[in-house]
C-alpha cells in the first residue's frame, strides 16, 4: 500500500546543537526501516545529509537532527522520503521555532530567614544566544494534594527562586519542577526538569533541636537534619562566592 | 604544503571541448569544496563553478551554464572541469582553488585560501 | 547577482604610507554577527591570485599584520600600513555568502 503522512513534521530547535522534527503517518510504520528525513541547510556549498527517525509511537515518528549552532538566518530544506518517494517537503528555520534546553540539576536548600532556596542550571553555556534570554516557570506542588499548587515565574537572570516556608504547609511533601522559554525567539516552553521532592517545614528549626521530626523521607531527628541544613547553606555560599571570583 | 596543480589547458577551436584537472596535495580533498575562476587576458577575476566536498552539490556562472560540467574524484584527488560548446569569450587562465569546508552542517569559510598556478584556454579558429 | 564596486581602480603611495581600498556590495554580505562573507586577495604581477583577508577581517595565514580588513554589511575596506615595494599588485574584494560568486573589479596599486 501506499505511504503517507497524515500530519506533517514540526520541528523545534534547541538553538544551539539540535533539531527534533515530529511526524504522523496515517498507519503504524516502523519508522527507522521505511523513512528517512533529509536536511540541507540553505547555503553555498551545504551538503545533503539524513537523519534515521525513530518511533515515538506506533505511527509517530520523530528524528533528531545535529545541527551548528544556530543563527538566525539559517534556513533547513527539508525532506521525507519513504524510498524513492517523497513523502513531504518544507523548510525550518531553527531561530523561528525555539524550543530551550531543558534546565538542570534542580536542588531546594534551607536558607536564612526560613526560605526555601530553589536553585538549577541554565542549560545553555554563557557564549549561547539563549544563555541570557531565558526566564523560567517553577511548579510547585503538594505530594499530597492536588489542588495545593503554585506556579513562579523568575523573569530576573539569576535561576533561582526563594521561597517562604510558611506560604507551603506544614509538614507536607512538596514536589519541584521548572522549564524555561525564551521570549524574544517567541520560543515554547521546554520540557519540564525532573521533579525535586523536600518535606516543608517552617516553625523556627532553633526550637526543634533533639525534637524528632516526622519525616518519613529523611529519618533523622532535627539534630541531624540541621547538621544537614548548615553544610548545604555553607556548601551554597563557597559556590556563590567562588562563582563571583569568575 | 597545500598544493594545487592544474592542467589541460590548450588551444581549441570555437564548438570544441576540454577538460581541466586539478590535483591537490597536502590537505583532507574530500572535505573541502572547490571552486574554478579564471582570469581572461588583461581582465579581473571571474568565478566559474564551485562543488562540495562530496561532489553532491555543484553551482556554476551564467556565463557556462549548460556548457561546463565541474566535478571531482575524491580517491584521485582530482578536480575537473569539462568544457563544451567553447567559444572565444572563454579565452583565460582558468585557476583552481580551495574553497569552504563543507563536512561539517554549516561549511567553515576561510576565503579561496589556496590557488593553483593556472592553465591557459585559448579558444580561437 | 551581488555586484561588488572596487574604488579606487588604481592607486599610487610611497613605501612607509598607509594605502586603504574600499569595497562596496549591492546587498549585505552579514550573514551572522561577526560573519561578514567578503575576502580580499592579492594579485603580483605575472603570479596566481593569493589570499590576504577573509570573512571582512580575518587574516590568511602568513598574511603579516600589516594588512588588516574592516567593514561590515556592505561597506568594506582593506588597509595596508607601512606599504613596501613588494606590495605592488591588482587587490581584489571578493564576496563568498552566495552563488555566484562575485569579483570587485580590482584596484591597482602601484608603489612610487
Known amino acids: 500500500g501506499s505511504v503517507k503522512v497524515l500530519h506533517e513534521p514540526s520541528c523545534f530547535s534547541d538553538y544551539i546543537s539540535t533539531s527534533v522534527c515530529q511526524w504522523k503517518m496515517d498507519h503504524p510504520t516502523n519508522c527507522s526501516a521505511e523513512l528517512r528525513l533529509s536536511y540541507q541547510l540553505d547555503f553555498m556549498g551545504s551538503e545533503n545529509h539524513t537523519c534515521v527517525p525513530e518511533n515515538r509511537e506506533d505511527s509517530v515518528c520523530v528524528c533528531s537532527m545535529p545541527i551548528d549552532d544556530a543563527v538566525e538566518a539559517d534556513v533547513y530544506q527539508l525532506d521525507l522520503w519513504a524510498g524513492q518517494q517523497l513523502l513531504w517537503s518544507g523548510s525550518f528555520q531553527p531561530s523561528k521555532h525555539v524550543k530551550p534546553r531543558t534546565p538542570g540539576n534542580l536542588t531546594v536548600h534551607p536558607n536564612i530567614s526560613h526560605t526555601w532556596l530553589l536553585m538549577w542550571t541554565n542549560p545553555y553555556p554563557t557564549e549561547n544566544h539563549l544563555h541570557s534570554e531565558l526566564t523560567y516557570m517553577v511548579n510547585v506542588s503538594n505530594d499530597n494534594d492536588p489542588e495545593d499548587f503554585k506556579v513562579y515565574n523568575v523573569t530576573y537572570m539569576g535561576p533561582t527562586l526563594r521561597l517562604a516556608a510558611s506560604t507551603l504547609k506544614s509538614g507536607a511533601s512538596y514536589s519541584a519542577r521548572v522549564r524555561a522559554w525564551a521570549q524574544t525567539y517567541n520560543s515554547t516552553w521546554s520540557d519540564w526538569s525532573p521533579s525535586t521532592t523536600w518535606l516543608n517545614y517552617y516553625e523556627p528549626w532553633e526550637q526543634h533541636l533533639g525534637k524528632p521530626i516526622p519525616n518519613p523521607l529523611l529519618g533523622l531527628d532535627s539534630t541531624g537534619l540541621n547538621d544537614i541544613f548548615e553544610a548545604q547553606k555553607i556548601e551554597w555560599h563557597e559556590h556563590h562566592h567562588h562563582h563571583h571570583h569568575h | 604544503e597545500v598544493q594545487l596543480v592544474e592542467s589541460g589547458g590548450d588551444l581549441v577551436k570555437p564548438g570544441g571541448s576540454l577538460r581541466l584537472s586539478c590535483v591537490a596535495s597536502?590537505?583532507?580533498?574530500?572535505?573541502?569544496?572547490m571552486t574554478w575562476v579564471r582570469q581572461a587576458p588583461g581582465k579581473g577575476l571571474q568565478w566559474v563553478s564551485l562543488i562540495s566536498g562530496s561532489g553532491g552539490k555543484t553551482y556554476y556562472a551564467d556565463a557556462v551554464k549548460g556548457r561546463f560540467t565541474i566535478s571531482r574524484d575524491n580517491a584521485k584527488n582530482t578536480l575537473y572541469l569539462q568544457m563544451n560548446s567553447l567559444r572565444a569569450e572563454d579565452t583565460a587562465v582558468y585557476y583552481c582553488a580551495v574553497d569552504r569546508l563543507t563536512k561539517t552542517i554549516r561549511p567553515q569559510y576561510y576565503g579561496l585560501w589556496v590557488w593553483g598556478q593556472g592553465t591557459l584556454v585559448t579558444v580561437s579558429s | 547577482d551581488i555586484v561588488m564596486t572596487q574604488t579606487p581602480l588604481s592607486l599610487s603611495v610611497s613605501p612607509g604610507e598607509t594605502a586603504s581600498i574600499s569595497c562596496r556590495s549591492s546587498q549585505s554580505l552579514l550573514y551572522s554577527i561577526g560573519y561578514n562573507y567578503l575576502d580580499w586577495y592579492l594579485q603580483k604581477p605575472g603570479q596566481s591570485p593569493q589570499g590576504l583577508i577573509y570573512l571582512g577581517s580575518k587574516r590568511a595565514s602568513g598574511v603579516p599584520d600589516r594588512f588588516s580588513g574592516s567593514g561590515s554589511g556592505t561597506d568594506f575596506t582593506l588597509r595596508i600600513s607601512r606599504v613596501e615595494a613588494n606590495d605592488t599588485g591588482v587587490y581584489y574584494c571578493?564576496?563568498?555568502?552566495?552563488?555566484?560568486?562575485?569579483f570587485g573589479q580590482g584596484t591597482k596599486l602601484e608603489i612610487k
Open positions: 597536502g590537505f583532507p580533498f574530500r572535505d573541502y569544496a
Open positions: 571578493m564576496q563568498g555568502l552566495q552563488s555566484p560568486l562575485t
